[in-house]
Interface confidence: low
């Protein structure tokens, strides 16, 4: 007896972890036996080379060559989403459509959201080592390592919450070097090593003694960047101080620091950081291009001693450590509009005095660059030729131009076609958006920007054809 198709096994969401192939299953019943057709983001798959999809006789879809596994690039996670697959089973009595299954890639960014810091804790008291793991897909698991070995979490004594390690009762054996390790199927990332010192509790019956302590902050020195921190180190300073007064009643010392405001302005609030030292210590958490005030305060349990004198230090400006964001190209009347958003504040590394915009050679614009002064975040470039326009933008501080954004390209004739044919379609393509199409076309992982530009005319022509086929 004839019957319409029914999906028995729906494709499942899955993570592509390479090197391949990825498989999507679909099984259907029906009489006559239905034929299976697959769609990606609602568009039928051609299955004709060089399409990397292949259909097995049982209806299973193989994705032979998915894009390279996600990785951090210029501090930005690549899209983890390769698309939503659905299968259709059809016979003469009708068509059944499966649930959509999302195929995504594993990604783990380089940068920790919060790095653990050196600290001093007191025996019997609780302390927390903070760690904000890098963004990842799937969400990374966090483990803690101590002195080069994984830390075995003891129920009731250790708690890990959101990546941070809470130690309920400090013991002398907790002293050591701690590291937070984030792991997912894209790999693993290690935080900086944080030194934890554990002190014996000292109950002074006379906190009055603490009030008699005098602290002279003698030196604040900018430290050489740690090569282990990579090409964009954050500044750190070395504080050294002298203590006079009663016999060292202070259990610990805290650095207080703030950015200096203009004369007559209201002072910024003081930030506090427990120091892992008794006469000198390193202090991080600062930003390039700022003027800072520093002082040191002794404490013993809950009792605080008087603050030291204040020392000033100007941290030099550096080039911005991140590119401008959301760079877009839009066609105008005989012009091309470039616009962007400044880099995140923590990456300014000084005062942004303007922006540098480059056009890339080998396109319709000759190689050129423009300087945009001040806070303006757009530029109008006059042009009368159709063709492809590719630009990069970098932020500029007193130290020079920072890293440029990824190239963004606009195909003028295509932008006009789109404006008339597909008003709901998103704006210009970035090379990142094109890369997936180009990899599929050329049956291999993306060959880098230079190669993309070398073969640009062919690639752009084919990528457009491919894009229209998919959308």
């Amino acid at each position: 007896q004839d019957s319409p198709p029914q999906i028995l096994v729906h494709p499942q969401d899955q993570l592509f972890q390479g090197p391949g192939p990825a498989r999507m299953s679909c099984q259907a019943s029906g009489q006559p036996p239905p034929t299976i057709r697959w769609l990606l983001n609602g568009q039928p798959l051609s299955m004709v080379p060089p399409d990397p999809h292949h259909l097995l006789p049982d209806g299973t879809l193989l994705l032979l060559q998915p894009p390279a596994r996600g990785h951090a690039h210029d501090g930005q996670a690549l899209s983890t989403d390769l698309g939503v697959y659905t299968c259709e089973a059809s016979n003469r009595l009708g068509t059944a459509v499966s649930r959509g299954a999302r195929l995504s890639v594993a990604v783990l960014r380089e940068d920790f959201q919060i790095q653990p810091r050196d600290m001093v804790a007191v025996v019997g008291e609780q302390f927390t080592l903070e760690c904000g793991p890098p963004w990842g897909h799937p969400e990374p698991t966090v483990s803690w390592w101590k002195d080069g070995k994984p830390l075995a979490l003891q129920p009731g004594r250790h708690t890990v919450s959101g990546g941070s390690l809470l130690m309920a009762r400090a013991e002398k054996s907790d002293e050591g070097t701690y590291m937070c390790v984030a792991t997912n199927s894209a790999g693993h990332r290690e935080s900086r090593a944080a030194r934890v010192s554990i002190q014996e509790p000292q109950d002074y019956t006379e906190p009055v003694e603490l009030l008699a302590v005098r602290i002279q902050l003698e030196n604040v020195t900018l430290l050489n960047p740690d090569p282990a921190e990579g090409p964009k180190p954050r500044p750190a300073v070395w504080l050294s101080w002298k203590v006079s007064g009663p016999a060292a009643p202070a259990q610990s010392y805290t650095a207080l620091f703030r950015t200096q405001t203009a004369p007559g302005g209201q002072g910024a609030p003081w930030a506090e950081e427990l120091l892992a030292g008794w006469q000198s210590a390193e202090l991080g958490g600062l930003h390039w291009g700022q003027d800072y005030e520093f002082k040191v305060r002794p404490s013993s349990g809950r009792a605080r001693g008087p603050d030291s004198n204040v020392l000033l230090l100007r941290l030099p400006e550096k080039v911005p450590s991140a590119p401008p964001q959301e760079v877009t190209l839009k066609p105008g009347n005989g012009t091309v509009f470039v616009s962007w958003v400044p880099p995140p504040a923590e990456n300014h590394n000084g005062i942004i005095r303007g922006y540098q915009v480059w056009s890339l050679g080998n396109t319709s614009l000759p190689p050129a660059n423009w300087t945009v002064v001040g806070e303006q975040t757009q530029l109008e470039i006059a042009t009368h030729m159709p063709g492809s326009y590719c630009v990069q933008v970098a932020a500029v501080t007193g130290a020079g131009a920072g890293e440029p954004s990824r190239p963004v390209c606009l195909l003028l004739e295509q932008a006009m076609e789109r404006a008339t044919q597909e008003p709901s379609e998103h704006g210009p393509w970035t090379l990142e958006q094109l890369r997936v199409d180009l990899e599929v076309l050329f049956q291999g992982p993306g060959s880098g920007l230079n190669d993309i530009f070398e073969a640009q005319k062919i690639e752009w022509h084919e990528a457009r054809a491919h894009h229209h086929h998919h959308h």
Partner: antibody, heavy 119, light 115 residues
Framework: QIQLQESGPGLVKPSQSLSLTCSVT?????????WTWIRQFPGNNLEWMGY???????DYNPSLTSRISITRDTSRNQFFLQLESVTTQDTATYYC????????????WGQGTMVTVSS | QPVLTQSPSASASLGASVKLTCTLN???????IGWYQQHRDKPPKYVMF???????SKADGIPDRFSGSSSGADRYLTISNIQAEDEAIYFC?????????????FGSGTHFTVL
């Protein structure tokens, strides 16, 4: 893909030392993880012997501490097991293994090498 | 350190279900464990991580027929719709920390036979 391969003599005389090498491909042993030796006795029981971590930290099974040593050569991406004063009780299949995520859950294993202790 | 107890053998029919048990000694009843599958003449293969609260996390490529759960000091590996290739020895393993010494112990293994 991480791959591990054990190598070393299949026959050792009692009271001598047993030396095995684990060669790792697809991942640097100084980049992460715990590089572990596990053995399986003829009755199928598994015994964790010890590890050297990517940072050089070492822990051994307390029952073996007096006669085990695990070392590494990061330039050759290998780590080694040395077991002194062996007896017939050390006859086993020796595996090197490493976890992929959670520290003591071993996702990657070598094929194993059978070592017989006999005179 | 923890002691993990497994029954020596278990069996079930093709297409049926089986629940293998790994029991921790009482002072370690909150510990997480890992399950491993070992076919003849092959190294053990990591199957999943079972937490003290019953949550579990499967290794890549492990079919949905395998699941984990927990009750008190017992950790379970359930195999449903049993296939011939599921015949193997199943081991559980747990890590421990003893005065800063970190290590791992295994259960003695359950020989699982498909009837």
């Amino acid at each position: 893909q991480i791959q591990l391969q054990e190598s070393g003599p299949g026959l050792v005389k009692p009271s001598q030392s047993l030396s095995l090498t684990c060669s790792v491909t697809g991942y640097s042993i100084s980049s992460g993880s715990l590089w572990t030796w596990i053995r399986q006795f003829p009755g199928n029981n598994l015994e964790w012997m010890g590890y050297i971590s990517y940072a050089g930290g070492i822990d051994y099974n307390p029952s073996l501490t007096s006669r085990i040593s695990i070392t590494r050569d990061t330039s050759r991406n290998q780590f080694f097991l040395q077991l002194e004063s062996v007896t017939t009780q050390d006859t086993a299949t020796y595996y090197c293994a490493t976890p992929g995520g959670y520290p003591f859950h071993f996702d990657y294993w070598g094929q194993g090498t059978m070592v017989t202790v006999s005179s | 350190q923890p002691v993990l107890t497994q029954s020596p053998s278990a069996s079930a029919s093709l297409g049926a279900s089986v629940k293998l048990t790994c029991t921790l000694n009482s002072q370690f009843s909150t510990y997480n464990i890992g399950w491993y599958q070992q076919h003849r003449d092959k190294p053990p293969k990591y199957v999943m991580f079972v937490k003290g609260d019953g949550g579990h996390s499967k290794a890549d490529g492990i079919p949905d027929r395998f699941s984990g759960s927990s009750s008190g000091a017992d950790r379970y590996l359930t195999i449903s719709n049993i296939q011939a290739e599921d015949e193997a020895i199943y081991f559980c393993g747990a890590d421990y920390n003893n005065a800063g010494q970190y290590g791992c112990v295994f259960g003695s293994g359950t020989h699982f036979t498909v009837l």
